[in-house]
């Protein structure tokens, strides 16, 4: 018995998430953050 | 706001082909979770639901009456619109289009329904 | 298919008085996505139904609270508080859940 088909109501946005790591000098160590969209957020 | 409207023929004879148009505003068919419905109402009696098309062209039909029906869509120009062949006096009904909306998961309704366009098959 | 059994088949109710309708399907609507697609709309003489009331008991925007409606699994009401004049009309029940889609066969009701 076939069902009908209901939608989520939702549209899926993909977004792409960036780690990166960051050298800014010997005695400052690293920073580390996560981009996501375009936005540094740690 | 919402509006949908129904136009076809008014009068077809037995054995031909059928073409009815919707023609709706205030509603996008490329918008996820959206779709149109045809339901019809013979005089005076219930009403029975026909065909669906869904915003992406998927499309359900009752299988009552699958091999004669036909759903489709112009999402530019807001129309979709249904075929019925070898029509019979018994397809003799005021035709619906009706609108099905999801509002959020899972959350869809047949929220606006056309005026109704009438169908009479007679030779 | 699943056939939808609406009763009573004409409901003669007085101004003021709560009015019952029930709504009875030949198998179980509960959708595998685990919602039941049970409606109600309200057809006035020489217009096109218009919907009260969705998912078993939500009301549709604009629908006064005076409708209500309960159920679940194959036994579903539609509740009028206390009718008025404007609510004359048929009334159907709808299962969304099974193709093909099915309606109730309707309720007229009308003022005594």
């Known amino acids: 018995d076939a069902e009908f088909r209901h939608d989520s109501g939702y549209e899926v946005h993909h977004q792409k998430l960036v780690f990166f790591a960051e050298d800014v000098g010997s005695n400052k160590g690293a920073i580390i953050g996560l981009m996501v969209g375009g936005v540094v957020i740690a | 706001q919402v509006t949908l409207k129904e136009s076809g023929p008014g009068l077809v004879k037995p054995t031909q082909t059928l073409s009815l148009t919707c023609s709706f505003s205030?509603?996008?068919?490329?918008?996820?979770?959206?779709?149109v419905s045809w339901i019809r109402q013979p005089s005076g009696k219930g009403l029975e639901w026909l065909a669906h098309?869904?915003?992406?062209?998927?499309?359900q039909y009752n299988p009552s009456l699958k091999s004669r029906l036909t759903i489709s869509k112009d999402t530019s120009k807001n129309q979709v619109f249904l075929t019925i062949t070898s029509v019979d006096p018994v397809d003799t009904a005021t035709y619906y289009c009706?609108?099905?909306?999801?509002?959020?998961?899972?959350?869809?309704?047949?929220?606006?329904w056309g005026q109704g366009t009438p169908l009479t098959v007679s030779s | 298919d699943v056939v939808m059994t609406q009763t009573p088949l004409s409901l003669p109710v007085s101004l003021g008085d709560p009015a019952s309708i029930s709504c009875r399907a030949s198998?179980?609507?509960?959708?595998?996505?685990?919602?039941?697609?049970l409606e109600w709309y309200l057809q006035k003489p020489g217009q096109s139904p218009k919907l009260l009331i969705y998912?078993?008991?939500n009301r549709f925007s604009g629908v006064p609270d005076r409708f209500s409606g309960s159920g679940s699994g194959t036994d579903f009401t539609l509740k009028i508080s206390r009718v008025e004049a404007e609510d004359v009309g048929v009334y159907f029940c709808?299962?969304?859940?099974?193709?093909?889609?099915?309606f109730g066969g309707g309720t007229k009701l009308e003022l005594k």
């Open positions: 009706v609108r099905r909306a999801s509002s959020s998961r899972y959350d869809d309704q047949f929220d606006y």
């Open positions: 205030g509603f996008s068919l490329s918008t996820s979770g959206m779709g």
């Open positions: 098309i869904y915003w992406d062209d998927d499309k």
């Open positions: 198998q179980s609507i509960v959708h595998s996505n685990g919602n039941t697609y």
């Open positions: 998912r078993v008991s």
């Open positions: 709808f299962q969304v859940t099974h193709v093909p889609l099915t």
